[in-house]
């Protein structure tokens, strides 16, 4: 039966004579007249079992004391701490030639835990122990005892256990305490990796490499390793573990994030409070759920606040110019908490009789700078039909609009286009070319935008480069241009006019008059 005594965490006691209740009962040789078990009182009036010998009068003493068998428990090196008191030979009368002031420490490895006799030849010497000059003054009862402490180690050990022996050669000595222990690096957690109790190596300089295992709710970042030093201290931590998503480090453990907190990734960061407009209802949240009506875009980090679609743009103003419309507006009052706001334009062509019957405008309408994803708050819309009702919707959109599209996010305006000039003439042909004339013909514009009143033909010598041109007007879709110079290149443009005015000139047609009369039907290519 052993009492409880507190020792360092890195020491595992195999034997402690001071913790034994009752007699130690170690084996002495000789049985009488050598080592004797004596009970003394300590400072708390508790009996301590000690062994003493004081055969100082006779020379050649050889008194042995052997412990019981001590299990090795897997240790390869053990330490023996001996607390003893040694009486100065000077304090004993008439013993100068025979009194000694040292004793010897031995050990014997054995798998047999019941060896009854001391066979001196089996024992190997560990060391000769002498009283240290710097002894500890320990109060044993009312006496101040000169208590020496000596520690020796022995190893490597390989058998199941061992015996210790103390050889007295003529000293006056008492073994007050014998403690045998081995050193271990105690179970510890470093960098969120748990390292188990590890017995130190056989050598006083050896390092035992130990791989750690990540604590609950954590994962390896780099393989965690440490070295167990011979003194029972952990050395050189390498690698680490990180708390899993939804967990944070607290006192060497990975604790679940509290309600209202989250952690998205396995990092060494702490749990963070849920961003604005989000919440978590469970411990260990890896993200926070957005409040009703709030959303997170696909590329939004978990740390970003939840946001919502913007409100409608404000102050939409339209400016109609014949078949073009300029629209301008202000930013929405509420951007939904996002910076990525942009605008889309929806164009609808509506019947004059029933404005509710609207159809998309189609691809003939052009938008400047663009129809969708506008970053500015203005757009020009061209190539509309004249005298037509159009409804334009300006939608404010952001990264979460797709999750909750609503009419509340747009503003609209309905306009009617004015009469517009005709579009340009697509194809002009030289039907006949002579030395002095060119016969031209062309098609009606794609969009006449009303009744064509006349066509205007503009022409000039190519070399003059439009510095000096002439105009011919005709109601027909053809005309003969006369009075030209032979063997000369001319450029021709045609445009149409309605009540709304002239359209744009056609692309130029280049024709060269002949030197010899001839007849050519052209397709708009240069004629020679």
């Amino acid at each position: 039966v052993t009492g409880s005594r507190v020792y360092p965490a890195n020491e595992v006691t195999l034997l402690d004579s001071r913790s034994v209740q009752g007699e130690l009962g170690w084996i002495a040789s000789p049985l009488e007249g050598g080592w004797e078990e004596v009970s003394i009182m300590d400072e708390k009036n508790t009996p301590i079992r000690t062994y003493q010998v004081c055969n100082v009068m006779e020379a050649s003493q050889n008194n042995w004391l052997r412990t019981d068998w001590i299990t090795r428990e897997g240790a390869q090196r053990v330490y023996i701490e001996i607390k003893f008191t040694l009486r100065d030979c000077n304090s004993l009368p008439g013993v100068m030639g025979t009194c000694k002031e040292t004793f010897n420490l031995y050990y014997y490895e054995s798998d047999n835990d019941k060896e009854r006799f001391i066979r001196e030849s089996q024992f190997g010497k560990i060391d000769t122990i002498a009283a240290d000059e710097s002894f500890t003054q320990v109060d044993i009862g009312d006496r101040i005892m000169k208590l020496n402490t000596e520690i020796r180690d022995v190893g490597p050990l390989s058998k199941k256990g061992f015996y210790l022996a103390f050889q007295d050669v003529g000293a006056c000595i008492a073994l007050v305490s014998v403690r045998v222990f081995y050193k271990k690096c105690p179970l510890t957690v470093r960098n969120l990796a748990q390292f188990p109790d590890t017995i130190t190596g056989a050598d006083t300089s050896s390092l035992v490499e130990v791989r750690g295992s990540c604590v609950n709710n954590s994962e390896e970042k780099d393989v965690p390793k440490m070295y167990c030093g011979a003194d029972g201290e952990w050395l050189v931590p390498i690698g680490n573990c990180l708390c899993n998503a939804g967990h944070e480090e607290q006192n060497g453990e990975c604790q679940a994030c509290k309600i209202g907190y989250y952690k998205a990734l396995s990092t060494d960061a702490s749990c963070a409070k849920c961003p604005p407009h989000s919440y978590s209802v469970w411990e260990g949240a890896t993200s926070c759920t957005c409040d009703r009506g709030f959303f997170r875009a696909d590329n939004d980090a978990a740390s970003m606040p939840c946001t919502r679609p913007p409100s409608a743009p404000l102050n939409l103003i339209s400016n109609v110019n014949e078949t073009s419309v300029n629209l301008e507006w202000s930013s929405p009052q509420n951007t939904g908490g996002r910076q990525d706001i942009s605008y889309n334009v929806v164009c609808k062509k509506c019947g004059a009789g029933d404005p509710s019957k609207c159809r998309p405008c189609g691809s003939g309408v052009h938008y400047t700078p663009q129809q969708n994803g506008l970053k500015t708050t203005r757009v020009s819309i061209t190539d509309l039909l004249a005298h037509t009702n159009y409804t334009f919707e300006i939608w404010a959109v952001n990264g979460v609009s797709k999750y909750n599209p609503s009419p509340d996010q747009s503003v609209s305006v309905t306009v009617t286009t004015n009469q517009a000039a005709p579009s340009s003439i697509a194809l002009v042909q030289a039907k006949e070319v002579t030395r002095y004339s060119v016969a031209l013909a062309w098609l009606e514009p794609d969009r006449p935008n009303g009744v064509i009143l006349e066509y205007e033909v503009k022409y000039y010598e190519k070399d003059q480069n439009e510095r000096s041109y002439r105009i011919v007007r005709t109601a027909a879709r053809n005309t003969d241009i006369k009075g030209l110079n032979p063997l000369t290149s001319y450029v021709f443009h045609v445009r149409a006019r309605t009540a709304a005015g002239y359209g744009d000139f056609s692309e130029p047609l280049e024709v060269t008059t002949n030197t010899v009369p001839s007849r050519i039907i052209g397709d708009g290519a240069n004629s020679t």
């Epitope: 007249g33 004081c54 009068m57 030639g97 009312d142 006496r143 006056c172 008492a174």
Partner: antibody, heavy 121, light 106 residues
Amino acid sequence: QVQLLQSGAEVKKPGASVKVPCKASGYTFTSRAMSWVRQAPGQGLEWMGWINTNTGNPTYAQGFTGRFVFSLDTSVSTAYLQISSLKAEDTAVYYCARVRFTVYGDGMDVWGQGTLVTVSS
Amino acid sequence: EIVLTQSPATLSVSPGERATLSCRASQSVSSNLPWYQQKPGQAPRLLIYGASTRPTGIPDRFSASGSGTDFTLTISRVEPEDFAVYYCQQYGPSWTFGQGTKVEIK
């Protein structure tokens, strides 16, 4: 077991001598010192001195020099106290006692039964 | 020469009571002070050595303490067989006994 055996009572005339033996058994005689103690009738204990049984070297207390001699015969594990020129005031019980030295302190741990020496004319 | 003075000379106690005996040295004897018990017609018996250590076989009702010049022997509960004379002794250069304290039945 460890014993010290002393001889029986002695009656001596003044001026005579007496030799009181103390035979040890149960331990190695030469490993422990032997002390002599006197106790006069109705009086306390009086230490006379001791002898180193290994070297034979005696130590005498004050007042016990000259007429008192400690000696040994190690071959028979016996210590002797010899008193010469006996006087009436030497009448007492004489004890031999084994001296025990220890780390913690010393003491006479085994005693003979005592020899009464009576000096009377 | 170191003189040991024991007190009281006689101590009357009843069985079961506590008895406290004192021994004072004329100069320090460290802790090297044994106590002896002597019953009438018998040789003394070593009770305590080194001021407080009991040899094998001495009952634990006997305890002692002290160092330097003042020493005490205590019998926690006196038994009938404890009525005797008790001597202290010192181991200085010359070993001397105290004059003794007689413990008698009250």
